[in-house]
């Protein structure tokens, strides 16, 4: 079954900074992935990026890079400014349309008190859904 | 095919507030980001802030930050935009625009909405 | 904050021609810069994209190029609709237009 996993994590350097680690598990190729906080793409969350692998990449405030790690992971970097909701306890969620599997999603989020630098444990899977 | 109506002119007066709207068609509003633009007569575009509406989550752009106030209404898939205190510095046309993501920003715009601000 | 400072602010060719606009930011903005034309009465149009990602419905004589800082925008064989104000649009992060181009015919 594939599986997508989601981490966060905040910027040691830079309190206010974070960054969003996701990864598909899975066979297939990967048509496009929607990054949302506040909840899933479609479900209540606000779309911060959507990566596709020819037409590009767009992200939108607060988030500043958003970027393919390999063919199947991406990573979005952050800045906690600006925006009517803080995100320093907002769960983050990555879909992945991929062919012929369909669309996974799974959210992660900062983990509690965490010191800067540590991220959120590798693979939460609070939501994972298939369309 | 995608469609941004605008609510019509507007003449106020110096001190209240209004609020304009912008209705959408043609596509799944809670999926696009709303955004607002101020043209001033003889002068450029400006952004003024952008509305998400699948989750109400706003941005502004310093400079209208407690001028303007987005919300939406995904019932009646409409946006609006609440301008406090006006003076004649607000007198000017407000267009929404969609921002079509990977197809583009600001892809659909509304047609304008005319303010005038004058005692 | 990006700035956008677009070049020249006004200019005039003739029909057949071809001009050029010119937008600089401040910063890296990779390659998110889009090119609208505006005209009075209506909303503006979107043309370009992503530096030179024309849209569906936008002719080939219309252009653009440029990465980094510097970006150009061309229109060539001018037709009398052409008449209109140009504006560039960083969209790298958040928002910033370009002050205009009025273009008109000779």
């Known amino acids: 079954t594939p599986e997508v996993w989601v981490q966060v994590q905040m910027e040691a350097t830079e309190l206010s900074s974070f960054t969003v680690h996701c990864g598909f598990l899975g066979p297939g190729s990967i048509s496009l992935v929607t990054v949302s906080w506040g909840g899933p793409d479609g479900a209540g969350g606000t779309k911060l990026a959507v990566l596709h692998p020819e037409l590009g990449t767009r992200q939108w405030a607060p988030a500043r890079q958003a970027r393919w790690e390999t063919q199947s992971s991406i990573s979005l970097a952050l800045e906690d400014s600006g925006a009517s909701s803080p995100f320093a306890n907002t769960t983050f969620c990555c879909k992945f349309a991929s062919f012929p599997e369909g669309s996974w999603e799974s959210c992660g989020s900062l983990p509690p008190s965490s010191d800067p630098g540590l991220s959120a444990p590798p693979t939460p899977v609070p939501i994972l859904r298939a369309d | 095919q995608v469609h941004l109506q605008q609510s019509g002119p507007d003449l106020v007066k110096p001190g209240v507030s209004v609020k304009i709207s912008c209705k959408a068609s043609?596509?799944?509003?809670?999926?696009?980001?709303i955004n607002w633009v101020k043209q001033r007569p003889g002068q450029g575009l400006e952004w003024i802030g952008w509305?998400?509406?699948?989750?109400?989550?706003?941005y502004y752009n310093e400079k209208f930050k407690g001028k303007a106030t987005l919300t939406v209404d995904k019932s009646s898939s409409t946006a609006y935009m609440l301008l406090s205190s006006l003076t004649s510095e607000d007198s000017a046309v407000y267009f929404c625009?969609?921002?079509?993501?990977?197809?583009?920003?600001?892809?659909?715009w509304g047609q304008g909405t005319t303010l005038t601000v004058s005692s | 904050d990006i700035q956008m400072t677009q070049s020249p602010s006004s200019l005039s060719a003739s029909l057949g021609g071809k001009v050029t606009i010119t937008c600089k930011a401040n910063?890296?903005?990779?390659?998110?810069i889009a090119w609208y034309q505006y005209k009075p009465g209506k909303g503006p149009r979107l043309l370009i994209h992503?530096?030179?990602t024309l849209q569906p419905d936008i002719p080939s004589r219309f252009s653009g190029s440029g990465s980094g800082r510097d970006f150009s925008f061309s229109i060539s064989n001018l037709e009398p609709e052409d008449i209109a104000t140009y504006y560039c649009?960083?969209?790298?992060?958040?928002?910033?237009f370009g002050g205009g181009t009025k273009l008109e015919i000779k």
């Open positions: 625009a969609r921002d079509g993501g990977l197809r583009g920003p600001f892809d659909y």
């Open positions: 043609g596509y799944t509003f809670t999926d696009y980001y």
């Open positions: 509305i998400f509406p699948g989750s109400g989550t706003t």
């Open positions: 910063q890296d903005i990779n390659k998110y």
């Open positions: 992503y530096t030179s």
């Open positions: 649009l960083q969209y790298d992060y958040l928002y910033t």
